[in-house]
């Protein structure tokens, strides 16, 4: 069968090969489409309700004035010429509708680095067959379920027209230290070949880095670093960089002889542990970075501890956690 694609609403003419150019003709058209139950036979004499949908022209061709979704199917013509030679024509008709330009709706103008964000929803209305939506970042296709990209898709069909509405919601996790203004776009690819994709206007949200790129953060438990004698202090060095750098510890400006670890525990605090602590993160790409210094002090019973975030240090009954 010869494949024919026709746009919905447009006229279609199918030739009946081997048919005499004008009557008298011996030919019949057989249709098996969404409008027929099994095969329907049409002859040049025609007439009746089918004429508004499909009719045989004087030259034997079949004319459909406005193709619809129900006209998809098989069309066959069997013709006999003046010499009694039989010719068969066989067509497989598929219909299509190109939707309006897709749009990104409900789009975010800010994204947060390091966490999942909804970028927006791409909507395409009025396609047939359904087709597909795909997302692009800086012109390159985004692959769902890769590198923090996820897509939620929905396809709806109009109850009367039979045309499709596609929706695609994009979620991304922007990398820390990445592009502060990535460009996203979405494109509709038709379900039938030989039709080019339709692309939305791009959107360019700003990326917010809520955890500092460059700073090494030192978190102290208990807050403020003041503890009763015999208590425990936990120092945690938080570094947003990937891959995780090596973390070393300093007390009063001097490196502590401990294996690298992001956590430093000072159990059973004594006077020798008091002092100013900091951590140093060493990245392969850009050298060592030191955190703020925190002060570790012992509160004698009845004393009030210093306020949270005061600057100060530690001592050596220490334990490093991998």
């Amino acid at each position: 069968a010869q494949n024919i694609t026709a746009r919905i609403g447009e006229p279609l003419v199918l030739k009946c090969k081997g048919a005499p150019k004008k009557p008298p003709q011996r030919l019949e058209w057989k249709l098996n489409t969404g409008r027929t139950e099994a095969w329907k036979v049409l002859s040049p004499q025609g007439g009746g309700p089918w004429d508004s949908v499909a009719r045989v022209l004087p030259n034997g061709s079949l004319f459909l004035p406005a193709v619809g979704i129900q006209d998809e199917g098989i069309f066959r013509c069997q013709a006999m010429n003046r010499n009694g030679k039989e010719t068969k024509s066989n067509y497989r008709v598929r219909v299509y509708q190109i939707p309006g330009k897709p749009e990104i709706v409900d789009s975010a103008s800010e994204l947060t680095a390091g966490v999942p964000n909804k970028v927006g929803t791409c909507v395409s209305e009025g396609s047939y067959p359904a087709g597909t939506l795909s997302w692009h970042l800086d012109g390159k296709p985004l692959v769902p379920n890769e590198k923090g990209v996820s897509v939620k898709e929905q396809t709806r069909r109009h109850p009367e027209t039979g045309l499709f509405t596609l929706q695609s919601e994009l979620m991304v996790t922007p990398a820390r230290g990445g592009d502060p203004r990535p460009t996203f776009s979405c494109s509709f690819s038709p379900g039938l070949p030989r039709h080019r994709a339709l692309r939305t206007a791009p959107i360019q949200p700003r990326v917010w880095e809520p955890v500092p790129l460059e700073e090494v953060q030192l978190v102290v438990e208990p807050e403020g670093g003041a503890v009763a004698p015999g208590g425990t202090v936990t120092l945690t060095c938080e570094v947003p960089a990937q891959p995780s750098p090596q973390i070393h510890w300093m007390k009063d400006g001097v490196p502590l002889p401990l294996p690298p670890s992001p956590v430093l525990i000072l159990p059973e605090i004594g006077p020798q542990d008091q002092g100013t602590y900091s951590c140093v993160a060493t990245h392969s790409s850009h050298g060592p970075q030191e955190s703020r210094a925190v002060s570790i002090s012992i509160i004698e019973p009845g004393e009030e501890g210093p306020t949270a975030g005061s600057v100060g240090g530690s001592g050596l009954g220490t334990l490093a956690l991998a």
Epitope: A108, E110, K118, R206
Partner: antibody, heavy 113, light 107 residues
Framework: EVQLQQSGTVLARPGASVKMSCKAS????????MHWVKQRPGQGLEWIGA????????YYNQKFKGKAKLTAVTSTSTAYMELSSLTNEDSAVYYC??????WGQGTTLTVSS | DIVMTQSHKFMSTSVGDRVSITCKAS??????VAWYQQKPGQSPKLLIY???YRYTGVPDRFTGSGSGTDFTFTISSVQAEDLAVYYC?????????FGGGTKLEIK
Amino acid sequence: EVQLQQSGTVLARPGASVKMSCKASGYTFTSYWMHWVKQRPGQGLEWIGAIYPGDSDTYYNQKFKGKAKLTAVTSTSTAYMELSSLTNEDSAVYYCTRNWDYWGQGTTLTVSS
Amino acid sequence: DIVMTQSHKFMSTSVGDRVSITCKASQDVSTAVAWYQQKPGQSPKLLIYSASYRYTGVPDRFTGSGSGTDFTFTISSVQAEDLAVYYCQQHYNTPRTFGGGTKLEIK
């Protein structure tokens, strides 16, 4: 340590313009958005706009377009906000904030005749 | 612009209590909500972003939850130093908009 040092209290006449500064230290100035926020006495917070000092890209709250102008000088790591055609409604504390995580101490602007 | 509504202007609580502050967005903002603390005479301080992510160095008694239009900020065990005004802010769309603030008073 990251610090944002804002210029001191400003007293201005209605109709005048003022330019306040926010000097950044302790981080790479060109790598972060600098936002500006308004807080009227006893009121909530209002976002004015932001500038990316790396390429001077700015974006504004529509409400403050024509009122506020954001600039940045990378050589001194200083962000500026100029407010024009001042009215009593502009009397407020103005904060600069680096990416919402570090904030300046605020500049108090009083507009009075 | 997206309107952020904090229904309680004031909340009174005691040290050690659990307190929750709510915030409602006028349209879907996914999980793009941050919470700030502003103590008297001080600049605001970022506590929570993207609805539930605690900012670096923020004590774990502060938590956030919610998505879409309804968000909650909780202090599991209120301390005296938590006396402050708490603001929600959507960071989904420009302009960023804040709630009116909830002042936490310690009994």
